[in-house]
């Protein structure tokens, strides 16, 4: 009874379409298939970034795979064939690993990398990226950014680039068509007459990093003798109310009464006959059924009653700024 | 099934030019890889060029600067224009295509019988 075995796939590689850190891991079919013509092979293929202590595993009857990485690291990868059980008499035959590594050979020490990067989607409509210069890098040094997410051709880079002292220290970044819900991949590189520059990558996904406009159009309703309600309106733009958590801060008479997480526009406040003064702010932020993470909003302008009747039905004041 | 059939090998002295062609017929419902690949006897085949997923082109080895890897997808067709030829590009050059039968719900991958480039020295 002779053993079966199987020849591990052929050509193994990762290809860089220049995504800035989507890749394609591809293979061809192993040789001396012909046994098995009738059966449908299998691949097990495990990759992660160098450092990482998990492989990711796909198990596939396809010739590639696409995913993203962070090219700030190596990336390594390992693929062997399986036989189904159903090829082999009831025992599924593994080749052995065929492996392949991928990296950018890094120019420029690391301290010339672009420092403190941080991006904020406002309102789920502008995205504005920022930036400090590397360490000890001269005024020659400018920073270009380049950007990827699935949908478009290839890598763009930054039109409207935000400046300081003539080096580019961040970026405007134009309308953004079907961006949302899948990673978007950020290459800022470098170039100076001096010494080269490190590249530094980043990937995020930009429903994660919305700040959104604070709430607008404060006002009070009395409910009942004791109760008195709180609303306002979710801002302009494009972000849908079901997409809001509210903290709302209110002072009574000059002390704190309440802060309260609320998921919407509404909220109802027990109050007392003695009270002489409220006021409350709210701010808001995309919550967990829109996004993975977000950032608070600042908060509203204040509103304000002060000095009249609370048991009034509908009390609106002027807007005083929060501070 | 499906057929792959190279032309434009031959006999071409060092530094001249050849353009090989592959056309692809058969039931075939996507084309998703076109790449050449070399073969010298007693030798592993080694892959020359590619076009793969999203366009992308990549070159291997000493063809790259001197090779230029196209296809034009209305034909089912890919072409690898060689250019500085040299003895060592002596070899058998076949076509692969990855991709997807009409009757088929995976990938699969397809061999032209390759065509003869000689680069006498």
């Known amino acids: 009874d002779t053993e079966i075995k199987v020849n591990p796939p052929q050509d193994f590689e990762i290809v860089d379409p220049g995504y800035l850190g989507y890749l394609y891991l591809q293979w061809q079919p192993p040789l001396s298939l012909d046994h098995f013509k009738e059966c449908t092979v299998e691949y097990e293929l495990k990759y992660r970034n160098i450092g990482s202590e998990t492989w990711k595993t796909i198990i596939t009857k396809n010739l590639h795979y696409k995913d993203g990485f962070d090219l700030n690291k190596g990336i390594e990868a390992k693929i062997h064939t399986l036989l189904p059980w159903q090829c082999t008499n009831g025992s599924e035959v593994q080749s052995s690993w065929a492996e392949t590594t991928y990296w950018i050979s890094p120019q420029g020490i690391p301290e010339t990398k672009v420092q403190d990067m941080d991006c904020v989607y406002y309102n789920w409509q502008y995205l504005l990226c920022s930036w400090k210069p590397g360490i000890g890098v001269l005024l020659d040094t400018n920073y270009n950014l380049f950007y990827w997410y699935e949908g478009l051709d290839h890598a763009l880079q930054c039109v409207d680039y935000i400046k300081a002292d003539g080096q580019n220290i961040g970026c405007r970044f134009p309308y953004l068509e079907a961006s949302d819900y899948k990673d978007f991949y950020i290459c800022v590189n470098g170039s100076s007459e001096n010494k080269p520059i490190r590249s530094s990558y980043f990937t995020f996904q930009l429903q994660n990093i919305v700040k959104p406009l604070p709430p607008v159009y404060l006002t009070f309703t009395r409910e009942s003798s004791c109760e008195i309600k709180l609303k306002w309106s979710i801002p302009l733009g494009p972000i849908p109310a079901r997409c809001f958590d509210y903290e709302i801060e209110i002072r009574e008479d000059d002390t704190t009464l309440v802060t309260a997480t609320v998921e919407n526009e509404t909220y109802t406040l027990k109050t007392t006959n003695e009270t002489r003064q409220l006021c409350f702010v709210v701010r808001s932020k995309v919550n967990i059924y829109c996004s993975d993470d977000g950032i608070w909003s600042e908060w509203s302008d204040k509103q304000c009653w002060e000095g009249e009747d609370l048991s009034k039905k509908t009390l609106l004041r002027h807007h005083h700024h929060h501070h | 099934q499906v057929q792959l059939q190279e032309s434009g090998g031959g006999l071409v002295q060092p530094g001249g030019s050849l353009r090989l062609s592959c056309e692809v017929s058969g039931s075939i419902f996507s084309i998703n890889r076109m790449a050449w690949y070399r073969q010298v006897p007693e030798k592993e085949r080694e892959m020359v060029a590619q076009?793969?997923?999203?366009?992308?082109?990549k070159y291997y080895g000493s063809a790259k600067g001197r090779f230029t890897i196209s296809r034009d997808s209305a034909k089912n067709a890919v072409y690898l224009q060689m250019n500085s030829l040299k003895p060592e590009d002596t070899a058998v050059y076949r076509c692969?295509?990855?991709?997807?039968?009409?009757?088929?719900?995976?990938?699969?991958?397809?061999w032209g019988q390759g065509t003869q480039v000689t680069v006498p020295s």
């Open positions: 076009i793969t997923y999203g366009d992308t082109i």
């Open positions: 692969n295509i990855v991709g997807v039968l009409t009757t088929g719900h995976y990938e699969d991958s397809f």
